[in-house]
Structures are given as structure tokens and as C-alpha cells.
Amino acid sequence: LPAQVAFTPYAPEPGGTCRLREYYDQTAQMCCSKCPPGQHAKVFCTKTSDTVCDSCEDSTYTQLWNWVPECLSCGSRCSSDQVETQACTREQNRICTCRPGWYCALSKQEGCRLCAQLRKCRPGFGVARPGTETSDVVCKPCAPGTFSNTTSSTDICRPHQICHVVAIPGNASMDAVCTSTSPTRSMAPGAVHLPQPVSTRSQHTQPTPAPSTAPGTSFLLPVGPSPPAEGSTGD
């Protein structure tokens, strides 16, 4: 004969445990039902009656099967630099994440406690490592032959256009200027130009002008390491 299915509350076998979605009530010394997500235990079980569950009130929740006497309070409303990516319901807490252009500087178990605006690389500097949900943008100086003319948290250093005839040579913050005939650059469709790790030869330090070796080519000498926020703006 099949074993008889026990209905809660019931006394567990000596040394046994309660089943899934049940808990052992120390007072009643019985296996009793847990309450489902979105509810809490309004009345605990006894030897003869099972747990009585009730729905969570507004702005409170339970996410798991439980036997808590009160539902948990949802977190406070999201701040102006955050967006609500998960609303407060009876079954889940509100989750606030940083809005686009910001990253999480101080995280909590779910969502973010403190958001900060992503660093913007100033002209002459490009994004070496893009920002993520939890990390800031890293800027790098545009290496020779490349430039960035924007203040941006997303723009990388791009190569100067190759001209048929150069009117003004490019520099770190300006593209080459070509005369009337069309330049010879077009980005390959679908070519994802990802920021590259800065190799030692393009890790240029804060430059100091040196005597020019030739018109249109101003060679500069490095004098020392750049400060950490070099290339970024404060906003």
C-alpha cells in the first residue's frame, strides 16, 4: 500500500524533516505550511490548525515562501538619477538602477544605492574602457594619427582622415582638414571599432612642447604621469 499523504499540520518522523514549502513550528512541534510569495503568516499553526496566510499590504512584499508575521517594506522611491527597473509589488521589492549616462558607485543587494555620472572624455582623449552599470569610463589620450573632438562618455579616438591633399594636419583633438578633393576615409559597415587597451607606446604622458622638428609636425616630450582624471570633465 502507498504511504498515506500527511496533511499539515502533522508530526514529522523522529529525526525526519518537513517537506518542501513547509516549516517546523517549535511551539506546535508540527510541520506546517509556509505562505506563498506576496503573503505572510497572519496566524501561526497549532497542533490542530494550519498556518493562516494573508496578503501583503500596499508597499510591502514577500519574495519567497515564508512564515514571517509581517511583510517586508519596499525600498524608498527611486532618486532623480535613477530609474525604477522593477516596481514594488506584493511579491517583489522595488529595484532602482542608474539612468543612462550614470553608473552605480555604491551598490546594494538589489539595485543601486548611489549613482554617479559617467566621466566624459574631453577633446584629445577618447574612451579606453566604456562605462558599465557598476564602473566608470576610463579615458586615454588619443595616440598620434588619431583624434577625438568631442566631450563624451562614449566616443573613442578615431584615425585622422587620409587626404588627397592636406590643408591642415590633424592633431589629438582635430581631424585632418583636406582641400577640395574628397578625403579617403569611410568606416567599414559593421566594423565595430572597440576601444583598445592602451599599449605602452601610446600611453602618452602629459606633454610639454619641444622645439619643432619640421613645420606641421610638432613633436612633444612627456614630462610625467597624468593625473587619474586626465582627459575627463567633471560633469
Epitope: 598620434p144 592636406v166 590633424g170 622638428t213 616630450l221
Partner: antibody
């Protein structure tokens, strides 16, 4: 714009030869490096040297070419490559090519972005006894 | 000295097929890489510079990619006119690193 090499010839080992690169449609002194690249018959490309094409322009050479090859600018439209102590291994088509300059940040003597965007048709140098 | 290793030495493709050419630098060249196309009796032609930027007039079926020491030229929808030898080139020069070309890859179109 165009480039054209001249001076290629059949010479005997141990002699010297000067190749000339003539630019048309642009001035050498306007923000360009003029370079020389060679290609032995049926082989790959081998960079030789470049000169920043302004008066007293800076030069840079492949390590194997230093001493035996000299690049210079002779006018606003011509650059030359002087080759000495030629051997059979120097038999090749010699191309002149240009690459664009820009304001440089870094160490003196470092040249980045040497993209050869304009080439001449080449001139053949044969070294044989 | 910087060495550019290009593979394969030769590749055959049918019209409409895809060709992939690899170029490995012996050290990080920080995207300073160019690709050239050379046909018999002609000088090389610059196709791609700074690893992924097409020069004007070059069909979009040519695509450059890669970073650090590994670079790739992909020709999608190969055409008869693409039959040529292709060279990669590290586009950087200093006292201890010289501009260098790969050994070349011959593309045969069937």
C-alpha cells in the same frame, strides 16, 4: 596626384645608384612623408626609409638600410634614394610612396600611422655581373 | 624586431564566397595596422587603415578587424576583381620598432 620613380637600371655589384621620385599635383613640402619600399621579384614588400618632406626634413630608416641607403628631398616635387655597395640581393622594383603627417604627441623620433596612401608604379633595379 | 606573420600564404575562393586573411604581430601594435591589395605589375593599393577603416572607393565587402596582436581581413561576397595578393603592415616606427609588412596572401578566385 601621382608619384613616379625613375633611375632604375641594370648595374654591377658594388656600384651605386640614385633613384628619383617625382610628385605631380601636390607639393612634397605640404604635410607628407615620402617613403621608399622595395619588392624583389616574386617576393613581398620591404620598407626602406622615409623623409619628412620639408627642408631639412627628419629621416628614418629600416635597420638593414642604415648606412647604405640615403633618402633626401631635392626640390619641392622630387625626393631621391641613394644606394651604395649594391648586391644581387638588392635586385627589386623600388616604389616611392607617401604618408600623411599630423601633429605628433610622444617621443621625438616616433612616427605613427605610416599608411602609404599613394604609390608610384615602381622602377626596376637589377644588380648583376 | 617587429615581425608580421600573415596566414595563409595562399587561399582559393569561389565567386560569392568569403575569404579570411589573418595577420599576427609579434608585439602589440595598438591598431596601427593597414591592409593593401596588389595586382601583378601594379603598386599596392591601401584598402584599410587603423585596423578597420576603409579608404574611399574600397567596396564594403572588405572588412578589417582585430586589436592588440591579432588582425583579420575579411572579404565577403568575393568577386573576380578581388584576385590579388594582400599584405598587412604595421604602421608604426620608433627606435626599436620598424614599420613591417606581412609576407602576403595570394587570393585566387575560381
Amino acid at each position: 596626384q601621382s608619384l613616379e620613380e625613375s633611375g632604375g637600371d641594370l648595374v654591377v655589384p658594388g656600384t651605386s645608384l640614385t633613384l628619383t621620385c617625382t610628385a605631380s599635383g601636390f607639393d612634397l613640402s605640404s604635410f607628407y612623408y615620402m617613403c621608399w619600399v622595395r619588392q624583389a621579384p616574386g617576393k613581398g614588400l620591404e620598407w626602406i626609409a622615409c623623409i619628412y618632406a620639408v627642408s631639412s626634413g627628419s629621416t628614418y630608416y629600416a635597420s638593414w638600410a642604415k648606412g647604405r641607403f640615403t633618402v633626401s628631398r631635392t626640390s619641392s616635387t622630387t625626393a631621391t634614394l641613394q644606394m651604395t655597395s649594391l648586391t644581387a640581393a638588392d635586385t627589386a622594383t623600388y616604389f616611392c610612396a607617401r604618408h600623411q603627417s599630423y601633429e605628433t604627441y610622444g617621443y621625438v623620433g616616433v612616427v605613427y600611422a605610416t599608411y602609404f596612401s599613394l604609390w608610384g608604379p615602381g622602377t626596376l633595379v637589377t644588380v648583376s655581373s | 624586431a617587429l615581425v608580421m606573420t600573415q596566414t595563409p600564404a595562399s587561399v582559393s575562393a569561389a565567386v560569392g564566397g568569403t575569404v579570411t586573411i589573418n595577420c599576427q604581430a609579434s608585439e602589440d601594435i595598438d591598431s596601427y595596422l593597414a591592409w593593401y591589395q596588389q595586382k601583378p605589375g601594379q603598386p599596392p593599393k591601401l584598402l584599410i587603415y587603423y585596423a578597420s577603416y576603409l579608404t574611399s572607393g574600397v567596396p564594403s565587402r572588405f572588412k578589417g578587424s582585430g586589436s592588440g596582436t591579432e588582425y583579420t581581413l575579411t572579404i565577403s561576397g568575393v568577386q573576380c576583381d578581388d584576385a590579388a595578393t594582400y599584405y598587412c603592415q604595421s604602421a608604426f616606427y620608433s627606435n626599436n620598432t620598424e614599420t613591417a609588412f606581412g609576407g602576403g596572401t595570394e587570393v585566387v578566385v575560381k
